[in-house]
Interface confidence: low
């Protein structure tokens, strides 16, 4: 079942390649399990990102290896997607399943354009 | 009279505030004299950031003291804009005016956002 | 102990319907999904569907649906799978299981299986 | 869907021989996944889960390793009530499907 997810449109990551922001869900149940995967659209590929499971309340576990980590609070999880290069500039797309109890619910926002620029390096201290 | 005028959608500044982008006018006529403003718009509110009226053919001559610097080849334009920080970040609006010969053209481009990210400080030499 | 018990065997004609049951006993009938699964003979196994019996929530497999209905009574802590417009296709064992205590987020697994009710479509 | 594809679909081997099954997913799964040992005429029963976690009262010389796509079901040494079929599952997204199976038959 389709399930409406809102994320902004477009974030600046920051000099030390850091970018947040919030992906939203419009829950028609209550869900205790959701999990939530962000994926990359960049020249018409989609790659995973990161994915994490959580129940609602707690907080979200990514990978040890994952550049992603979250909150969780209501219907709105807080990503931030660390060690961004320019290269990585691109949509960053919030995808959210509702896994627990049924009916599973599945929602893909719009995507996030995120714009990472890369630091001039600092000049070598003598 | 109206004239189309290109330019890009979302531009990112470098990490030392310097953006950089074409602004291009299908121009209906042999215009020798060719005036281009370069408008912010942000919160609703729109400021002039520089000005430049230049003879086709010649360089554009900017104020001494403006942000804008740029070069002209046919109908574009490569406006570059230095000094740029995280709250300059904004809609920056190419206007182009065919001054000389009548009769007179204005064009409105839709805007470049132009995304500006203030660097990390570097770490104080010893 | 966990026991999942199901329905007998049926031989039904194509067109018709089925009704499989699963009797559940030794657990808490409303804290686990209960999920369906059959295998044609010789063939792989097949997701069909999951009912939350607590809620009544559920999920098909996009392939079943609008054929396969899935119930569950609470008061008699049984589950069931009605599969309608049978085609000789359908013939197979059909399984219900349910799905492990949610231990670890990761924990999606079927850990207790009834012995399988084999459905028979033939003319 | 999800596509599991499993391999080999049947093999030969002895008592004491170390077997290895695999499974590939046509997608990440993140360790969502399964494995299920059959007998003829029985139901499937649980060996892994979360890809590595054994189940309840499996022997230890079943193991199951990977990531991502690629997913692994080994017998350090195998027994001779181990002769069965053996599936793979995922657990990503519904719906949840299974892998074709591995036949291990005694040589």
């Known amino acids: 079942k389709a399930m409406h997810v809102a994320q902004p449109a477009v974030v600046l990551a920051s000099s030390r390649g850091i970018a947040s922001f919030v992906c939203e869900y419009a829950s028609p149940g209550k869900a205790t399990e959701v999990r939530v995967t962000v994926l990359r659209q960049a020249d018409s590929q989609v790659t995973e990102v990161c994915a994490a499971t959580y129940m609602t309340g707690n907080e979200l576990t990514f990978l040890d290896d994952s550049i992603c980590t979250g909150t969780s609070s209501g219907n709105q999880v807080n990503l931030t997607i660390q060690g961004l290069r320019a290269m990585d500039t691109g949509l960053y797309i919030c995808k959210v399943e509702l896994m627990y109890p049924p009916p599973y619910y599945l929602g893909i926002g719009n995507g996030t354009q995120i714009y990472v620029i890369d630091p001039e390096p600092c000049p070598d201290s003598d | 009279k109206a004239m189309h005028v290109a330019q890009p959608a979302v531009v990112l500044a470098s990490s030392r505030g310097i953006a950089s982008f074409v602004c291009e006018y299908a121009s209906p006529g042999k215009a020798t004299e060719v005036r281009v403003t370069v408008l912010r718009q942000a919160d609703s509110q729109v400021t002039e950031v520089c000005a430049a009226t230049y003879m086709t053919g010649n360089e554009l001559t900017f104020l001494d003291d403006s942000i804008c610097t740029g070069t002209s080849s046919g109908n574009q334009v490569n406006l570059t804009i230095q000094g740029l920080r995280a709250m300059d970040t904004g809609l920056y609006i190419c206007k182009v005016e065919l001054m000389y010969p009548p009769p007179y053209y204005l064009g409105i481009g839709n805007g470049t956002q132009i995304y500006v990210i203030d660097p990390e400080p570097c770490p104080d030499s010893d | 102990q966990v026991q999942l018990v199901q329905s007998g065997a049926e031989v039904k004609k194509p067109g018709s319907s089925v009704k499989v049951s699963c009797k559940a006993s030794g657990y808490t009938f409303t804290d686990y999904e209960m999920h369906w699964v059959r295998q044609a003979p010789g063939q792989g196994l097949e997701w069909i569907g999951v009912i939350d019996p607590e809620t009544g929530g559920i999920t098909y497999n996009q392939k079943f649906k609008g054929r396969a209905t899935l119930t569950a009574d609470k008061s008699t802590s049984t589950a069931y799978m009605e599969l309608s417009s049978l085609r000789s296709e359908d013939t197979a064992v059909y399984y219900c299981?349910?799905?492990?205590?949610?231990?670890?987020?990761?924990?999606?697994?079927?850990?207790?299986w009834g012995q399988g009710t084999l459905v028979t479509v033939s003319s | 869907d999800i596509q599991m594809t499993q391999s080999p679909s049947s093999l030969s081997a002895s008592v004491g021989d170390r077997v290895t099954i695999t499974c590939r997913a046509s997608e990440n799964i993140h360790n969502y996944l399964a494995w299920y040992q059959q007998k003829p005429g029985k139901a499937p029963k649980l060996l892994v889960y979360n890809a590595k976690t054994l189940g309840d009262g499996v022997p230890s010389r079943f193991s199951g390793s990977g990531s991502g796509t690629d997913y692994t079901l080994t017998i350090s040494s195998l027994q001779p009530e181990d002769f069965a079929t053996y599936y793979c599952?995922?657990?990503?997204?519904?719906?949840?499907?299974f892998g074709g199976g591995t036949k291990v038959e005694i040589k």
């Open positions: 599952q995922h657990f990503w997204s519904t719906p949840w499907t």
């Open positions: 299981t349910r799905r492990g205590a949610r231990a670890t987020v990761y924990n999606y697994v079927m850990d207790y």
